[in-house]
């Protein structure tokens, strides 16, 4: 399940006398090119990431789906380590994402696209826990409902990550990852799953339809999306409190 090695080399950043910590640090030292870069978050070995440079600074692409070329129905260890092709579809890896965010709050951007070409860009404030929390995503109220929380405490809800072989979802009666597909912060199963099975047309059987890529509050429950991209950017340390 290792991330494939890219063809082109990572860019050099001369102003830093070490590898950059993340895409945002790259942006802050003047890098304006998007693409593949080697980074080294604190306490982590170096690894390659896809950076997208925008008016909101440098963002790390943590997930991309657009053609069904990569199987996302994988076990815990794969989601932890990352898999896919950095030039195509991929999941960066929970451990890598956590090493980038550390204990800081982060901004999560989610780009969704349906089969009619309509697009939606969502932004959330989140906090990602480490493996000891099953990489729980702590959510502010607006997104918590979309990931399965019916009532959200003021501090936000923590939704653990789940795969078919490590069931941490908020349902006692079922394993969301088994009944749906892929690994995700499932909550109560029915609100979203951007790591589901890729469908080019809407399956007739509801059981199959449930396994797709969907975001309930945008195109509806189980509408199979055409493309998704997830990007993350840690907030400055003082903004995390």
């Amino acid at each position: 399940p290792e991330m494939a090695q890219p063809v082109d080399p990572a860019h050099n950043v001369s102003r830093l006398h070490r590898l950059p910590r993340d895409c945002q640090e790259l942006f802050q030292v003047g890098e304006r090119q998007s693409g593949l870069f080697e980074i080294q978050p604190q306490g982590s070995p170096p690894f390659l990431v896809n950076c997208k440079m925008t008016s909101d600074g440098g963002w790390t692409v943590i997930q991309r789906r657009h053609d069904g070329s990569v199987d996302f129905n994988r076990p815990w260890e794969a989601y932890k380590a990352g898999f896919g092709d950095p030039h195509g579809e991929f999941w960066l890896g929970l451990e890598k994402v956590h090493s980038i965010t550390g204990d800081r709050n982060s901004r999560l951007a989610v780009q969704l696209r349906d089969w009619d070409g309509n697009a939606e860009l969502l932004q959330f404030s989140v906090h990602l826990g480490g493996e000891d929390t099953a990489y729980s995503l702590q959510l502010t109220a607006p997104v918590a409902g979309q990931l399965g929380a019916t009532t959200v405490p003021p501090s936000g809800l923590s939704v653990p990550f789940s795969t078919w072989d490590q069931d941490h979802d908020l349902r006692r009666d079922k394993n969301c990852a088994k009944s749906l597909s892929g690994g995700w912060w499932f909550g109560t199963c029915s609100h979203s799953n951007l790591n589901g099975q890729y469908f080019r047309s809407i399956p007739q059987q509801r059981q199959k339809l449930k396994k797709g890529i969907f975001w309930k509050t945008w195109r509806g429950r189980y509408y199979p999306l055409q493309a998704t991209t997830m990007l993350i950017q840690p907030m400055a340390a003082e903004a995390a409190s």
Epitope: D8, Q33, M53, T54, D56, G57, Q111, L121
Partner: antibody, heavy 118, light 107 residues
């Protein structure tokens, strides 16, 4: 439906000021970076300035730095371009544009004409 | 800054023709390339985003291809409403740069 409507253009003398506005509707304004792009028959399309979603970060092309100020009011779904010390070479049609994360400039306003002449 | 060289600057063609317009970047832009159409007195309209993705509501006769530094917009069968100016935008490098434009005229 995404709509961007510019206003505030006109004829102005060199050295004077003008403020452009862009009213946005049909999308969550605070989720998108915004930009101003200008167009002339000789130079074609030129990016002028960009602003981050929250408005705290701004970027300018070198030729307008120190003279132009981009800003936004997310409560009013509006972005602005304050143009000071205008020069004849600033004469152009100015477009307000929406900038997404992974697909960049997707929607443009109809444009507003700015003419700097004595 | 990344330079975008668009060719040709002018193109004469007839209804039904297949036409191609090219944009060459001064360095790799990782498929972050959009194509736009602009008619006289109108705002630019995005046709293609990220090299080959068709914008909502754009006819399928428009297509895009390319990678690295070389990108192409193809109109498979020209229609009367397609006579306009076309330009590309690279957004691999923030804030992005435009091609010089291609004016497509009726032969």
């Amino acid at each position: 439906e995404v709509q961007l409507v510019e206003s505030g253009g006109g004829l102005v003398q060199p050295g004077r000021s003008l403020k452009l506005s862009c009213a946005a509707s049909g999308f969550t304004f605070s989720n998108y970076g915004m930009a101003w792009v200008r167009q002339t028959p000789t130079k074609g399309l030129e990016w002028v300035a960009s602003i981050s979603t929250g408005g705290s970060d701004t970027y300018y092309r070198d030729s307008v730095k120190g003279r132009f100020t981009i800003s936004r009011d997310n409560a009013k779904n509006t972005q602005y371009l304050q143009m000071d010390s205008l020069r004849s070479e600033d004469t152009a049609t100015y477009y307000c544009a929406r900038q997404g994360f992974t697909e960049d400039t997707d929607y443009w306003g109809q444009g507003v004409m700015v003419t700097v002449s004595s | 800054d990344i330079q975008m060289t668009q060719s040709p600057s002018f193109l004469s063609a007839s209804v039904g023709d297949r036409v191609t317009i090219n944009c060459k970047a001064s360095q790799n832009i990782n498929k972050y390339l959009n194509w736009y159409q602009q008619k006289l007195g109108e705002a630019p309209k995005r046709l293609i985003y990220n090299t080959n993705n068709l914008q909502t509501g754009i006819p399928s006769r428009f297509s895009g291809s390319g990678s690295g530094t070389d990108y192409t917009l193809t109109i498979s069968s020209l229609q009367p409403e397609d006579f306009a100016t076309y330009f590309c935008l690279q957004h691999n490098s923030f804030p992005g740069t435009f091609g010089g434009g291609t004016k497509l005229e009726l032969k």
